[in-house]
Interface confidence: medium
């Protein structure tokens, strides 16, 4: 099974060292997922030319991937801790179906794809504990997710390659923004 941060023997605190705070654990966890995404992107870029496609060309897609906007309160201008935390958790929950889609999309990095998915689930749990007083978090409908997954898997090879690339790029951008915002909390 993929090793998650905190499970690896290297992560065990040395005598007299400070245990990780919950913020540091979340920080480390996101960095771990980002490293996994980098590995997956390498495989995707090696097997298709999607990575060379311009951002504008790739923007012409009908995927509704979560994205940070000014109103979400996660940027320095207009930062709002509660609003932002809700956005991060909601966004991660929405990404779950796309991470499920990625599971059969990799050959040499199959285990890495699983690690990214599992680590994201753990991250959501961490963050839900942090946001226990916030009730504005909406979970995607399982039936909606199931039909979206079926739709994505029915695409032709070229579209599946593009979808994979877009999911990885968007998830990376979302996590980077989340990481920054969480460091302010």
């Amino acid at each position: 099974a993929p090793v998650l941060p905190g499970e690896d023997s290297k992560d065990v605190a040395a005598p007299h060292s400070q245990p990780l705070t919950s913020s540091e654990r979340i920080d480390k966890h996101i960095r771990y997922i980002l490293d996994g995404i980098s590995a997956l992107r390498k495989e995707t870029c090696n097997r298709s030319n999607m990575c060379e496609s311009s951002k504008e060309a790739l923007a012409e897609n009908n995927l509704n991937l979560p994205k940070m906007a000014e109103k979400d309160g996660c940027f320095q201008s207009g930062f709002n801790e509660d609003t932002c935390l809700v956005k991060i958790i909601t966004g991660l929950l929405e990404f779950e179906v796309y991470l499920e889609y990625l599971q059969n999309r990799f050959e040499s990095s199959e285990e890495q794809a699983r690690a990214v998915q599992m680590s994201t689930k753990v991250l959501i749990q961490f963050l839900q504990k942090k946001a226990k007083n916030l009730d504005a978090i909406t979970t995607p409908e399982p039936t909606t997710n199931a039909s979206l997954l079926t739709k994505l898997q029915a695409q032709n090879q070229w579209l599946q390659d593009m979808t994979t690339h877009l999911i990885l790029r968007s998830f990376k951008e979302f996590l980077q923004s989340s990481l920054r915002a969480l460091r302010q909390m």
């Epitope: 920080d27 320095q76 990481l179 460091r183």
Partner: antibody, heavy 122, light 109 residues
Framework: EVQLVESGGGLVQPGGSLRLSCAAS????????MSWVRQAPGKGLEWVSA????????SYADSVKGRFTISRDNAKNTLYLQMNSLKPEDTAVYYC???????????????WGQGTQVTVSS | QSALTQPSALSVTLGQTAKITCQGG??????AHWYQQKPGQAPVLVIY???SRPSGIPERFSGSSSGGRATLTISGAQAEDEGDYYC???????????FGGGTHLTVLG
């Protein structure tokens, strides 16, 4: 267009004081953290001090702690650096830098002024 | 405030790839950002958040970071890329900014 214009530099004797100003325009100044970064002649960049968007939090490099004070006036869109007890090793070009829309705890600098020269010499 | 280490100088032939590394400090947990500085000018941000490129920066500039080491890559270096390059990050507390010592890039030919 974002513009940062530093002023207040000059020649000062060791132990003296100077106050640098940085006039900002082209963005919502009160929404962004700001920093001062310096560069000694022929040397690399050295971060000096930072202040968050509201002015309530500040931080300093060890080399200037207790001698320099960063502040801002959001009504005037101006950043300041009060430099006291100046030493010859403070001689440098001082840049005012706007932090990107990133986060107070994880800065990067997306816009820089052209710098103002501070020379500390007897 | 822990320092970031960069090679002091690097030469690359026109059109070839230049890789500038930066390590140390808290790069394992903090983002790396890269700046280009030409003589007599203010620094310019060329890469932020390890691998993101600001608008207006040519696509030949890219960045990566892994295991406490950040790398700035210039694919197909041009004469105008000659100058000093600095990496920058936050310290582990996030309360201080740290710059690398700078790398002078020379483009030959």
């Amino acid at each position: 267009e974002v513009q940062l214009v530093e002023s207040g530099g000059g020649l000062v004797q060791p132990g003296g004081s100077l106050r640098l100003s940085c006039a900002a325009s082209g963005f919502t100044f009160s929404s962004y953290a700001m920093s001062w970064v310096r560069q000694a002649p022929g040397k690399g960049l050295e971060w000096v001090s930072a202040i968050n968007s509201g002015g309530g939090s500040t931080s300093y490099a060890d080399s200037v702690k207790g001698r320099f004070t960063i502040s801002r006036d959001n009504a005037k869109n101006t950043l300041y650096l009060q430099m006291n007890s100046l030493k010859p090793e403070d001689t440098a070009v001082y840049y005012c830098a706007k932090e990107g829309d990133t986060g107070w705890k994880d800065p990067m600098y997306d816009y820089w002024g052209q710098g103002t020269q501070v020379t500390v010499s007897s | 405030q822990s320092a970031l280490t960069q090679p002091s100088a690097l030469s690359v032939t026109l059109g070839q790839t230049a890789k500038i590394t930066c390590q140390g400090g808290s790069l394992g947990t903090r983002y790396a950002h890269w700046y280009q500085q030409k003589p007599g000018q203010a620094p310019v941000l060329v890469i932020y958040d390890d691998d993101s490129r600001p608008s207006g920066i040519p696509e030949r500039f890219s960045g990566s970071s892994s295991g406490g080491r950040a790398t700035l890559t210039i694919s197909g270096a041009q004469a105008e890329d000659e100058g000093d390059y600095y990496c920058q990050s936050a310290d582990s507390s996030g309360n201080a900014s740290v710059f690398g010592g700078g790398t002078h890039l020379t483009v030959l030919g």
